[in-house]
C-alpha cells in the first residue's frame, strides 16, 4: 500500500477557497433509499430497497461537522426476524433479520502543532468508523 | 455543512513520516464477511453474512493507489432469486436478490499547481463513487 | 366445528363507507388468519384481504387504497371497511378463514354464507 | 399479480360422464423447496358460499367424493369430476395462494347435458 500526504497546514498555497472539502459539487450524502417513515414491519411491493426487503429497515442519521463525511446514516432493522415473501406482511422465524456492518474510512479534522507546539493547521486524520449498512436476511447460525 | 482544507504541500511540516495517511495503524480495508470462495447459490448456516444470508453475494476487490480507500469491496450476488429460508437451496422466485448501492466518499490524489502553473504536491479531491454493498432480499415490484 | 357469520348494511350510498362485521363461532380468532372476499353478482371472486388477530394486516393493491381490516378479539369479530364506494363494489361479501401452515397462507375454510351489499342513491 | 385464466367458461356433460375443468396461472405457482403448487379449487352452487375441494393441486379435501381429482403442475392444472352426479351442477373456481395478492380464476360453469 502507498502512502502519501494526509495534513493540511493553514497557511501557504493554495488559497482558501481551493481548500474546500470538495472540488466537485457534492450533494449531502444520502442513500437514495432513505425513508424515515418506513417504521412498519412489513415488505412493501413498491418504494426504495430498504422498504421492499424481507429484512427492512430505516436509516439514523449521524452528523459530525469535524469528520469527512460529515453525514453517516446507520440502518436499524424494524423486524427481528424475516418477513414472508408469500405475504410481505407476517414475519417468518425460519430467518433473522441482521444488520451488516462496515468499517469505513473516515477522516478527522484534528489540530496540528509545530516542532515548538504551535497550531499550525488542521491535520487530517483517517479512521475506521463502523457503520451499518443495511440489514440482511440469514439463515440462523446452526451452533455445532 | 462547514467546509476544511483538503490539500496538502508537499513540502513543509509536518514531516512526510506524520504526512502518512494514517495517524493510527489500520488494517486493510477488507470486509469481515469478506469469502471469495463462496460462489454457490446457496444459503449456509454457518460463517459469514454474505454466505448466511438468503441473498448471497461474494466480495470484488476494486483497488486504486491514487485514492482513498485504495481498497474497495464490490458486492456480486451469487443467486437472481432470493434461497429458501426453509432448505437454504432452492430459489424460490418470489423474492428478487438486489444489489443495495451506495455513493461512498472517496478521495483522490491530485497533483496542486503554484500560481506559475509549478507542481506544489498533492491535493485531496473528494468524489463521490458508486459501490455495491451487499444483495438484498426484496419482494418484486408490483406494476400499477 | 367453526362457523363464520357477516353482518351489516345490505344498502350503501355512493361515496360513502361500506361497513361489514364477521362473527366467528366454534375457534378462537386469535388462532388463525381471517379473510375477506367478494363477489360482484353473476361474476368471479376477488380477494380483499386478510388480518391476524395482532393487527398485522395484508390487502389487495387493487382496494389498498380504501380498504380497512380490524379485528375484535373479546368479541370474536373481525370487521370491513371499504370507503368511497361505487356501484362497481356491489357485491356479495364473503367471510372466510385462511388455513396457515409452514409460516405460509393456504386455502380459504371454511367460508360465510354472504352478505349482499348494494351501492345504490 | 399472477392472473389466473379458465377454461371452458361452461361445460355440458352427460350424467356419468367426465368433465374437465382448466385452469392456467401466468406465472409458475410451484415451490421447488417444499415441491409443492400453490393451487386450490373450489365448488360453488347456487345460493351458497365457495367450498374447498382440491388444495396443494391434487390433494382432495376430507369429505370430498373420490370422483373429484386435481392435477397438474407450474402453470397448468385440471381438475377432473370422474361421473359426473347431478348435485355436481356448480360453478368451479381454482385459486392461487404463492403470492399476494391472492388471487381466483373466473371461473367455469358445469351443467348436466
Known amino acids: 500500500y502507498s502512502h502519501w500526504p494526509s495534513c493540511c497546514p493553514s497557511k501557504g498555497y493554495p488559497s482558501e477557497e481551493l481548500l474546500r472539502w470538495s472540488t466537485v459539487p457534492v450533494p449531502p450524502l444520502k442513500p437514495a433509499s432513505l425513508d424515515f417513515h418506513s417504521v412498519s414491519c412489513r415488505a412493501s411491493e413498491d418504494g426504495p430497497l430498504n422498504s421492499r426487503a424481507i429484512s427492512p429497515w430505516r436509516y439514523e442519521l449521524d452528523r459530525d461537522l469535524n469528520r469527512l463525511p460529515q453525514d453517516l446514516y446507520h440502518a436499524r432493522c424494524l423486524c427481528p426476524h424475516c418477513v414472508s415473501l408469500q405475504t410481505g406482511s407476517h414475519m417468518d422465524p425460519r430467518g433473522n433479520s441482521e444488520l451488516l456492518y462496515h468499517n469505513q474510512t473516515v477522516f478527522y479534522r484534528r489540530p496540528c502543532h509545530g516542532k515548538k507546539g504551535n497550531h499550525k493547521g488542521y491535520c487530517l486524520e483517517r479512521r475506521l468508523y463502523r457503520v451499518s449498512l443495511a440489514c440482511v436476511c440469514v439463515r440462523p447460525r446452526v451452533m455445532g | 455543512y462547514s467546509h476544511w482544507p483538503s490539500c496538502c504541500p508537499s513540502k513543509g511540516y509536518p514531516s512526510e513520516e506524520l504526512l502518512r495517511w494514517s495517524t493510527v495503524p489500520v488494517p486493510p480495508l477488507k470486509p469481515a464477511s469478506l469469502d471469495f470462495h463462496s460462489v454457490s447459490c446457496r444459503a449456509s448456516e454457518d460463517g459469514p453474512l454474505n454466505s448466511r444470508a438468503i441473498s448471497p453475494w461474494r466480495y470484488e476487490l476494486d483497488r486504486d493507489l491514487n485514492r482513498l480507500p485504495q481498497d474497495l469491496y464490490h458486492a456480486r450476488c451469487l443467486c437472481p432469486h432470493c434461497v429458501s429460508l426453509q432448505t437454504g437451496s432452492h430459489m424460490d422466485p418470489r423474492g428478487n436478490s438486489e444489489l443495495l448501492y451506495h455513493n461512498q466518499t472517496v478521495f483522490y490524489r491530485r497533483p496542486c499547481h503554484g500560481k506559475k502553473g509549478n507542481h506544489k504536491g498533492y491535493c485531496l479531491e473528494r468524489r463521490l463513487y458508486r459501490v455495491s454493498l451487499a444483495c438484498v432480499c426484496v419482494r418484486p415490484r408490483v406494476m400499477g | 366445528q367453526v362457523q363464520l357469520q357477516e353482518s351489516g348494511p345490505g344498502l350503501v350510498k355512493p361515496s360513502e363507507t361500506l361497513s361489514l362485521t364477521c362473527t366467528v363461532s366454534?375457534?378462537?380468532?386469535?388462532?388463525?388468519?381471517w379473510s375477506w372476499i367478494r363477489q360482484p353478482p353473476g361474476k368471479g371472486l376477488e380477494w380483499i384481504g386478510y388480518i391476524f388477530y395482532s393487527g398485522n394486516t395484508n390487502y389487495n393493491p387493487s382496494l389498498k387504497s380504501r380498504v380497512t381490516i380490524s379485528v375484535d378479539t373479546s368479541k370474536n369479530q373481525f370487521s370491513l371497511k371499504l370507503s368511497s364506494v361505487t356501484a362497481a363494489d356491489t357485491a356479495v361479501y364473503y367471510c372466510a378463514r385462511v388455513r396457515f401452515s409452514d409460516y405460509e397462507l393456504n386455502w380459504f375454510d371454511p367460508w360465510g354464507q354472504g352478505t349482499l351489499v348494494t351501492v345504490s342513491s | 399479480d399472477i392472473v389466473m385464466t379458465q377454461s371452458p367458461d361452461s361445460l355440458a356433460v352427460f350424467l356419468g360422464e367426465r368433465a374437465t375443468i382448466n385452469c392456467r396461472s401466468s406465472q409458475s405457482v410451484f415451490l421447488g423447496s417444499n415441491n409443492k403448487n400453490y393451487l386450490a379449487w373450489y365448488q360453488q352452487k347456487p345460493g351458497q358460499p365457495p367450498k374447498l375441494l382440491i388444495y396443494w393441486a391434487s390433494s382432495r379435501e376430507s369429505g370430498v367424493p373420490d370422483r373429484f381429482s386435481g392435477s397438474g403442475s407450474g402453470t397448468d392444472f385440471t381438475l377432473t369430476i370422474n361421473s359426473l352426479q347431478a348435485e355436481d351442477v356448480a360453478v368451479y373456481y381454482c385459486?392461487?395462494?404463492?403470492?399476494?395478492?391472492?388471487?381466483f380464476g373466473g371461473g367455469t360453469k358445469v351443467e348436466i347435458k
Open positions: 366454534g375457534a378462537s380468532i386469535s388462532n388463525y388468519y
Open positions: 385459486q392461487q395462494y404463492f403470492i399476494t395478492p391472492l388471487t
